[in-house]
């Protein structure tokens, strides 16, 4: 039950996180005009990964896409790449994790397969979250660097007076969305990995085997030996992964694979 809950919660948290990463990637407000020097500006600038926008005094907002690919800063390209990789990995992770969910039965999928899929999706979510956090952090670092550079430039020129004040940019809403979303995806991935450990059946349960001692008709039913008992053939002491019927003894040994939440 706890495993199913952990897996389900991990999936939901990751789903929210990936939706947030997609939202952050599409948002225009990665950087917004710093209003410290001009709080009464009638023209407000903000920029995203794909376009820059200007809101004018009329209330009209004009956005223009970055139609060049080669002319863009390498850092911006890197951020775009990180965010896209994060989204792709997250989307694949979501797809894999849907089939890995314990509460969903698909044919006669073995628990080991579900465990492997859960682990795979968990790792994908972790990498996806890290990509998003890295992308947002690289962009934030770029902003901080540019902010202080433009601050230094602001007070240079003829007698310390400049007529054209350089527009400075600060953190936009998308950065915070990205950080939170990346964190959620990361947490979701960790939860999936934890759930994977609980999903993998432990090597403690075997099908009941009858051993016939020579000359006697005494049946031994060793229920749950981990190591060979030293008598009889050990080749039959195999852990079962099939979803088939179980003996009475085995039913007592560990919870059913088909627990539903």
């Amino acid at each position: 039950m706890a495993v199913t809950a952990c897996q389900g919660l991990g999936f939901v948290v990751s789903l929210i996180g990936i939706a947030g990463i997609i939202a952050a990637t599409c948002m225009d407000q990665w950087s917004t005009q710093d209003l410290y020097n001009n709080p009464v500006t009638a023209v407000f600038n903000y920029q995203g990964l794909w376009r820059s926008c200007v809101r004018e005094s009329s209330g009209f907002t004009e956005c223009r896409g970055y139609f060049t690919l080669l002319g863009l800063p390498a850092m911006l390209q890197a951020v775009r790449a990180l965010m896209i990789v994060g989204i792709v990995l997250g989307a694949i992770g979501l797809l894999v994790s849907i089939f890995a969910l314990k509460c969903i039965r698909i044919g006669s999928m073995e628990d080991s397969a579900k465990a492997n899929m859960t682990l795979t999706s968990g790792i994908m979510f972790i990498v996806s979250g890290l990509c998003a956090i890295a992308g947002v952090s690289v962009f934030a670092n770029m902003l901080v660097t540019n902010f202080w550079m433009s601050t230094a430039n602001m007070y240079t020129g003829m007698g310390g007076m400049v007529q054209t004040v350089q527009t400075r940019y600060t953190f936009g809403a998308a950065l915070f969305v990205g950080w939170v979303a990346g964190g959620l995806t990361l947490i979701g991935g960790v939860m999936m990995c934890i759930a994977c450990r609980g999903l993998a059946p432990e090597e403690t349960n075997y099908k009941a085997v009858s051993y016939h001692a020579s000359g006697h008709s005494v049946a031994y039913k060793p229920g749950g030996f981990k190591a060979s008992t030293g008598f009889g053939s050990n080749t039959k002491n195999k852990k079962i992964y099939d979803g088939g019927a179980r003996t009475e003894d085995e039913v007592q040994s560990y919870p059913s694979k088909h627990d539903y939440v």
Epitope: E56, S58, G59
Partner: antibody
């Protein structure tokens, strides 16, 4: 076509208040901010403030702060500008202005403040 | 507040003349975000509301004759009428559309010589 129709001329006593209306048509009212500008006789145009019809957010010229209130009735596509504590120097033609680049102006409302 | 200074305050010209009027702002009206200068020119005739002529310092509003042209950047701007027509005799205002409060120049009155 885009049109702004303002209310008629007003004559007020000093200390009184005036409320000028501006009915918009020919465009989506909430798409653009509504600005108010006045022009006193022989004076340059003077910006009073604006309202964002989407959220009711306003920004006023410090000169008029505390005396001016701009409101909107989005259902009627109408903006209002109320100026209180009127004085003789408030005698002017008041205009509402909207659309991109502040291209569309109302016909103007003459407010005369006289004792 | 940004102070807008227009010169001359009045101009006496004949029909067909080329006219240039200037507008200076106390601060730059250039927006680096979209590389535009937020200066607007209006024409006003007596008893009428101002009419938009030029926005972004040099972009003509639709329907405005091409004899009107705007130029300049930063703090210095000009409005030129290549060949004055009888209907052009009016007062011309420049406006700061970059920073609140939005401010207007004192105007240049174009009169018939």
């Amino acid at each position: 076509q885009v049109q702004l129709v303002q209310s008629g001329a007003e004559v007020k006593k000093p200390g009184a208040s005036v409320k000028v209306s501006c009915k918009a048509s020919g465009y989506t009212f909430t798409d653009y901010n509504m600005h108010w500008v006045r022009q006193a006789p022989g004076q340059r145009l003077e910006w009073i403030g604006y309202i964002n019809p989407n959220n009711g957010g306003t920004s006023y010229n410090q000169k008029f702060k505390g005396r001016v209130t701009i409101t909107v009735d989005t259902s009627a596509s109408t903006a209002y500008m109320e100026l209180s504590s009127l004085r003789s120097e408030d005698t002017a033609v008041y205009y509402c202005v909207t659309t991109r680049y502040l291209a569309v102006w109302g016909q103007g409302t003459t407010v005369t403040v006289s004792s | 507040d940004i102070v807008m200074t227009q010169s001359p305050s009045s101009l006496s010209v004949s029909v067909g003349d080329r006219v240039t009027m200037t507008c200076k702002s106390s601060q730059s009206l250039f927006n680096s975000g979209n590389q535009k200068n937020y200066l607007t020119w209006y024409q006003q005739k007596p008893g009428k509301a101002p009419k938009l002529l030029i926005y972004w310092a040099s972009t003509r509003e639709s329907g405005v004759p091409d004899r009107f042209s705007g130029s300049g950047s930063g703090t210095d701007f000009t409005l030129t009428i290549s060949s004055v027509q009888p209907e052009d005799f009016a007062t011309y205002f420049c406006q700061n559309d970059y920073s609140y409060p939005l401010t207007f120049g004192g105007g240049t009155k174009l009169e018939i010589k």
